[in-house]
């Protein structure tokens, strides 16, 4: 972001038109439609939680604000994926994780106002791994050989810009995990992240390039 | 054409287990939310649980009276759903469905298989 | 859980006739309801979804009505083909819950 001051502004619930940019992390929505206000409506929360990718088409909660009600809405459209993947380090093992996986992802996609979801391995699963507590190196080896103790989650998403890309204000979709993961952070070290899930490390990642093919 | 093809279904004692599983062809069905839906004989229609897309965690719901004794899983390289079934009782006696949750309601049930448990 | 109560639940008519089958929910469910028809030894078929959208492929003698906890099936003219039983389902909040059926038989 080239506005230095914009880091300043970037919580100031006032729309800087100079900072509205995804370099500069849309001004934290502040210009766009109310702004950061614009927050699911607290009756229907719960509900479009519920209800988030369940295969019925729910209108109420197919807004930005409450998650686009999990692209349930969207199947005939094609997905509009951004680049690479967005990787979090979520502080709960993965089988709590995955137990609350429709409230996970309807939260982060209000956050984000885009669709999200996990990224699938070869095998059609989740892309969700234990994530273990780091053992510090001077601890005995017979100690370190026992099995680490899993503490979190590393979640693996992709965020699908086909329906933020549809919307009226279409200026704001994260064309990249990275800008994301950006965004993220910037709500946290400003204390506005509103996520009920403990995030140890958010991050952008490239997609891995196709393996190069084998000379024969 | 979209089919779903239940089977498993069979004579169990009670406290006994069974997996049945469903058959999925003729849409992609790693992206369907899925139910399981059951009739005992000569009486209504029960819920018994739901399984969400991988992609959405594949998080399964259930209804109470089957809640800790039944798994919904899927295996979506096999297109196939599955219903575990443990700790059996003589109420679970019923026809089981296998039932495609679709956004625009173009629901798709299989033919269901009949599970007894009876001692 | 949220209760469904049909009435009523069972009910004989002629051909010709209008028929209307009603259906109570014991908490708002906005028009999360849909209407099923089964036949013996048959899988249940959807007639109406989101209380009152024709299901493609179904009859427009067929409607639906209602919002909130109080919802209606009306069959304008029963034909033979229509006696059946009939379940009404809310799919508002899991668990999902039928109501206990109303089979429709030939007076």
């Known amino acids: 972001c080239e506005a230095l001051q914009c880091w300043r502004l970037f919580n100031n619930s006032r729309c800087d038109p100079a900072c509205s940019s995804p370099a500069c992390l849309y001004d934290n929505f502040d210009c766009h439609a109310g702004g950061r206000e614009r927050t699911c409506n607290p009756v229907y929360e719960k509900y479009c939680a519920d209800h988030f990718a369940d295969g019925r088409c729910d209108q109420g909660c197919n807004t930005e604000e409450c998650g686009w009600d999990g692209l349930d809405c969207a199947s005939e459209v094609p997905a509009l994926l951004a680049r690479g993947v967005l990787v979090l380090t979520v502080l709960l093992p993965p089988e709590e994780l995955l137990r609350s996986s429709a409230d996970f992802l309807q939260r982060l996609s209000a956050i984000l106002r885009t669709s999200l979801r996990f990224r699938l391995d070869a095998h059609g699963q989740a892309m969700v791994f234990p994530y273990h507590r780091p053992s510090p190196g001077s601890e005995p080896r017979a100690r370190r050989e026992l099995a680490p103790e899993v503490i979190g989650s590393v979640v693996m998403l992709e965020i699908d810009n086909r329906l933020c890309l549809q919307s009226p204000e279409n200026d704001h979709c994260f064309p990249d995990a990275q800008s994301a993961a950006d965004y993220l952070g910037a709500l946290s070290a400003v204390e506005r992240l509103d996520f009920p899930y403990p995030l140890r490390d958010v991050r952008g990642e490239p997609l891995e390039p196709p393996e190069p093919s084998v000379p024969l | 054409q979209v089919q779903l093809v239940e089977s498993g279904g069979g004579l169990v004692k009670p406290g006994g287990s069974l997996r049945l599983s469903c058959a999925a062809s003729?849409?992609?069905?790693?992206?369907?939310?899925m139910h399981w839906v059951r009739q005992a004989p000569g009486k209504g229609l029960e819920w018994v649980g739901r399984?969400?897309?991988?992609?959405?965690?594949?998080?399964?719901d259930y209804a109470a009276p089957v809640k800790g004794r039944f798994t919904i899983s899927r295996d979506d390289s096999k297109n196939t759903l599955y219903l575990q079934m443990n700790s059996l009782k003589t109420e679970d006696t019923a026809v089981y469905y296998c039932?495609?949750?679709?956004?625009?309601?173009?629901?798709?049930w299989g033919q269901g298989t009949l599970v007894t448990v009876s001692s | 859980d949220i209760q469904m109560t049909q009435s009523p639940s069972s009910l004989s008519a002629s051909v010709g006739d209008r028929v209307t089958i009603t259906c109570r929910a014991s908490?708002?469910?906005?028009?999360?309801l849909n209407w099923y028809q089964q036949k013996p030894g048959k899988a249940p078929k959807l007639l109406i979804y989101?209380?009152?959208n024709l299901q493609s492929g179904v009859p427009s003698r067929f409607s639906g009505s209602g919002s909130g906890t109080d919802f209606t099936l009306t069959i304008s003219s029963l034909q033979p083909e229509d006696f059946a039983t009939y379940y009404c389902?809310?799919?508002?909040?899991?668990?999902?819950?039928f109501g206990q059926g109303t089979k429709v038989e030939i007076k």
């Open positions: 039932a495609r949750a679709e956004a625009r309601y173009r629901d798709v």
């Open positions: 399984i969400r897309a991988n992609a959405y965690g594949g998080a399964a």
């Open positions: 003729g849409f992609t069905f790693s992206t369907y939310v």
């Open positions: 908490q708002s469910i906005s028009s999360h």
């Open positions: 989101a209380a009152s």
């Open positions: 389902q809310q799919d508002y909040h899991t668990p999902f819950t």
